[in-house]
Interface confidence: medium
């Protein structure tokens, strides 16, 4: 991890106390004024998690990463990429123990969230809005984040089929047939 | 039919504090997350507050949270928002709506209005 | 200032067509998140004409349609109606912010004569 610089802040939240390691993991995404459309991420200071982005190629900010793990590795306090396990369990963030939050939106996306009861990454239906920090892209970037242990990974995780949206089945009450594409 | 039906409006002081109450009927209320959307008179539409349908996870706008808390009676088909520390600035007609597909809000009520003036 | 930047006022002629554009940036729009449209004619609630950048729901007239495309969206009306005449918001999810669902500032459309 990058050494705390005079660039520290504080910041308060209703999700956790949040201390990002710079000044510039604070600011806001800046695409800037320029037309190239270039995949990047940023630290995005109210849900806690680096973010992908479109930046423009030119201006900008400091908040603006080509990778992911750079981003997390830059603004995450006690990040630690954990692709080789340890059996200790590395201490991890604080939102790898919030509940699953599908949000209130009804974009069904596939999701992973780390189950403290099971210990383990498991598969959701995320709404495509609100919710929480404890929601990510791929199995492998959840289990990365906040599993503990040295286990061989598969599992009944791995196949977690269920469906826990509240209202699922039930769909709105006028357009039953709408599909709707997201990425 | 759906129907929405705000009630719980009126004027208060600076400070004082309101309680909004939504009846719903024409669906099943708890398979239903939950939104109040307010309009300032003669202004746009602002996103207040949300609850998912069992009433496990709530959201706010940053211009409410720590005083707004919005909540659900799913036996009683019912939504609150209970309004403390009000301010001029939360005058506006507030609606209660469901939502639906995607990230839309399917069905509005009518809409009740807060005043907040001394 | 609303997140998401509409024309405040636009106007046509009865049996024109008109389009009300709505532009975002990377955090929403651009991120892939949907627009919805909302009509809400005067001294009444808002109603959903366009969820899902392009669906309309059940009983509104074809003559409404939405799209987007990168960090903008439109709602295209085509042959205008006096009815018509009301004020339209575009909708969609900021995940820049703490978690908004955000509006556009809204368009009030005049049908003339």
């Known amino acids: 991890l990058p050494e705390e610089d005079d660039d520290t802040i504080n910041t308060d939240s209703e999700l956790r106390p949040m201390k990002p390691l710079h000044t510039f993991c604070a600011m806001k995404a800046e695409d800037g004024p320029c037309k190239a459309m270039i995949r990047s991420y940023y630290f995005n200071m109210n849900s806690h998690q680096c973010e992908e982005f479109i930046y423009g190629g030119c201006r900008g900010n400091k908040n603006r990463f080509d990778t992911l793990e750079e981003c997390r590795k830059t603004c995450i306090p006690g990040y630690k990429k954990t692709t080789i396990k340890t059996t200790s369990g590395a201490e991890k963030p604080d939102f790898c123990f919030l509940e699953e939050d599908p949000g209130i939106c009804r974009g069904f996306m596939t999701r992973y969230f780390y189950n403290n009861q099971s210990k383990q990454c498991e598969q959701f239906k995320y709404g495509g809005c609100l919710g929480n920090s404890n929601n990510f892209e791929t199995l492998e970037e959840c289990r990365n984040t906040c599993e503990d242990g040295g286990g061989s990974g598969g599992g009944l995780n791995d196949i977690f089929e269920a469906q826990k949206i509240e209202w699922h089945e039930g769909g709105p009450p006028h357009h039953h047939h709408h599909h709707h594409h997201h990425h | 039919e759906v129907q929405l039906v705000e009630s719980g409006g009126g004027l208060v002081q600076p400070g004082g504090s309101l309680r909004l109450s939504c009846a719903a009927s024409g669906f099943t209320f708890s398979s239903y997350a939950m939104s109040w959307v307010r309009q300032a008179p003669g202004k746009g539409l602002e996103w207040v507050s949300a609850i998912s349908g069992s009433g496990g996870s709530t959201y706010y706008a940053d211009s409410v949270k720590g005083r707004f808390t919005i909540s659900r009676d799913n036996s009683k088909n019912t939504l609150y928002l209970q309004m403390n520390s009000l301010r001029a600035e939360d005058t506006a007609v507030y609606y209660c709506?469901?939502?639906?597909?995607?990230?839309?809000?399917?069905?509005w009520g009518q809409g009740t209005l807060v005043t907040v003036s001394s | 200032q609303s997140v998401l930047t509409q024309p405040p006022s636009l106007s046509g002629a009865p049996g024109q067509r008109v389009t009300i554009s709505c532009t975002g940036s990377?955090?929403?729009?651009?991120?892939?998140?949907?627009v919805q449209w909302y009509q809400q004619l005067p001294g009444t609630a808002p109603k959903l004409l366009i969820f899902?950048?392009?669906n309309r729901p059940s009983g509104v007239p074809d003559r409404f349609s939405g799209s987007r495309s990168g960090t903008s969206a439109s709602l295209a009306i085509t042959g205008l109606q006096a009815e018509d005449e009301a004020n339209y918001y575009c909708?969609?999810?900021?995940?820049?912010?703490?978690?908004?669902?955000?509006f556009g500032g809204g368009t009030k459309l005049t049908v003339l004569g």
């Open positions: 709506a469901n939502n639906g597909a995607a990230a839309a809000w399917d069905y």
């Open positions: 909708q969609s999810y900021d995940r820049s912010l703490s978690g908004s669902m955000v």
């Open positions: 990377s955090s929403n729009l651009g991120a892939d998140y949907d």
């Open positions: 899902g950048n392009n």
